[in-house]
């Protein structure tokens, strides 16, 4: 909902959390043959003034962190997205019940930072 | 401060917002010739699901989302951030007082996505 | 023209909550955020927080955190400012005040006054 | 938190005379984003000043703010009736948005 992760307590600055995903709590149980499930982990934290080399900003997530400490009503922090995505390869059946083996592209956050 | 963007109603859905920056709000005045300032522009707005064709989500997003259907208090919406982004050329004094032309990547939003 | 309309005086016993609104006419409402800031007998404007009318997005003074909740109603161009757990001290006029990007307060309320007494 | 400091607490002059008064800020103010108010008695504060010199709207050009980093000042020439009042700096570049405790202008 739109009111998740409101909380007035200080987040950690931006990085990268593991997250395991099943495809059966996904509900992808019957057509994914393989994996069972992948480490897809998840970016999660603050962008804060001052954004540090840690943090992967870019010149424009810089920018808008002083932009945002000046005008917070108006400009949102930079937010931590993947940086680093990697592909998975899935086994699967097709709309026609064939076995089919792809890769999937930008599945496993590697890497997290300020955009 | 850490209770900013806590609004627990609806957000409009994650679209590039225009900003223009001046370099002299940022404070930048005395080191930058020129340009005066530029349209930075920013990146806002929900990534719910469903996430639609517009949003630019990668697999990843589009996984993310549905874990925190499932588990909203555990993994949050995958995050709208830029998804193209182009370069500005800066008249700048450098340390030693010397007129530099420099080219900053990253530095305009051209497009938001969901990641 | 471009204004904020704030509602009338209260008395309120300490420890209850008080709820004052500032109606905005003549701009488009959502284009701005509006903020909240008191006065006390002799003493300076303090700062309580703002809220986005685009969004609904709020931050609060360290001060008020937990005791002051702003929102708004886009249908009725308002905002409201709710201010709990009275105490003599929270006597005060308080107003609304608009901020544009990169600006300080343009346009006030006239002030709405507020009195905790036993 | 920036603090500011106003000086002085209060300023007795006669109409027509020159009004200045002074602003501290705690720790530089590179943007300059320092705004001058004037408040009357009963009323709700007005702007004056924004940028720590552009006037707002209506504001005559009598009235002038100047200053730089830490000391900043509002001038008012040639004092009219609607000037006596308090005046109040304001720091709005980063939150929380600090006042100054105020200089009051009075007749004489």
């Known amino acids: 909902s739109a009111s998740d992760y409101n909380s007035s307590e200080l987040k950690t600055a931006c990085r990268k959390h593991e997250l395991y995903v099943s495809f059966q709590d996904l509900g992808w149980q019957d057509w994914i043959i393989a994996p069972k499930g992948y480490a897809a982990n998840y970016c999660d934290g603050e962008c804060s003034f001052p954004l540090n080399a840690h943090m992967n900003a870019t010149n424009h997530a810089i920018v808008q962190t002083l932009v945002h400490l000046m005008n917070p009503e108006y400009v949102p922090k930079p937010c931590c997205a993947p940086t680093k995505l990697n592909a998975i390869s899935v086994l699967y059946f097709d709309d026609n019940s064939n076995v089919i083996l792809k890769k999937y592209r930008n599945m496993v956050v590697r890497a997290c930072g300020c955009h | 401060s850490a209770s900013d963007y806590n609004s627990s109603e609806l957000k409009t859905a994650c679209r590039k917002h225009e900003l223009y920056v001046s370099f002299q709000d940022l404070g930048w005045q005395d080191w930058i010739i020129a340009p005066k300032g530029y349209a930075a522009n920013y990146c806002d707005g929900e990534c719910s699901f469903p996430l639609n064709a517009h949003m630019n989500a990668t697999n990843h997003a589009i996984v993310q989302t549905l874990v925190h259907l499932m588990n909203p208090e555990y993994v949050p919406k995958p995050c709208c951030a830029p998804t193209k982004l182009n370069a500005i050329s800066v008249l700048y004094f450098d340390d030693n007082s010397n007129v530099i032309l420099k080219k900053y990547r990253n530095m305009v939003v051209r497009a938001c996505g969901c990641h | 023209q471009v204004q904020l309309v704030q509602s009338g005086a209260e008395v309120q016993k300490p420890g209850a909550s008080v709820k004052v609104s500032c109606k905005a006419s003549?701009?488009?409402?959502?284009?701005?955020?509006l903020h909240w800031v008191r006065q006390a007998p002799g003493q300076r404007l303090e700062w309580l927080g703002w809220i986005s009318a685009a969004n609904g997005n709020t931050d609060y003074s360290w001060k008020f955190q937990g005791r002051v909740t702003l929102t708004r109603d886009t249908s009725a161009n308002t905002v409201y400012m709710e201010l709990n757990s009275l105490t003599s001290e929270d006597s005060a006029v308080y107003y609304c005040?608009?901020?544009?990007?990169?600006?300080?307060?343009?346009?006030w309320g006239q002030g709405t006054l507020v009195t905790v007494s036993s | 938190e920036i603090v500011l400091t106003q000086s002085p607490g209060t300023l007795s002059l006669s109409p027509g005379e020159r009004a200045t008064l002074s602003c501290w800020a705690s720790q530089s103010l590179t943007n300059s984003f320092l705004a001058w108010y004037r408040q009357k008695p009963g009323q709700a504060p007005r702007l004056l000043i924004s940028?720590?010199?552009s006037r707002a709207t209506d504001i005559p050009d009598r009235i002038s703010g100047s200053g730089s980093g830490t000391d900043f000042t509002l001038t008012i020439n040639r004092l009219e009736p609607e000037d006596f009042a308090v005046y109040y700096c304001?720091?709005?570049?980063?939150?929380?948005?600090?006042f100054g405790q105020g200089t009051k202008v009075e007749i004489k």
């Open positions: 940028g720590a010199f």
């Open positions: 304001q720091y709005y570049g980063t939150s929380p948005w600090t």
């Open positions: 003549g701009y488009t409402f959502t284009s701005y955020a």
């Open positions: 005040a608009r901020r544009k990007l990169w600006s300080p307060f343009d346009i």
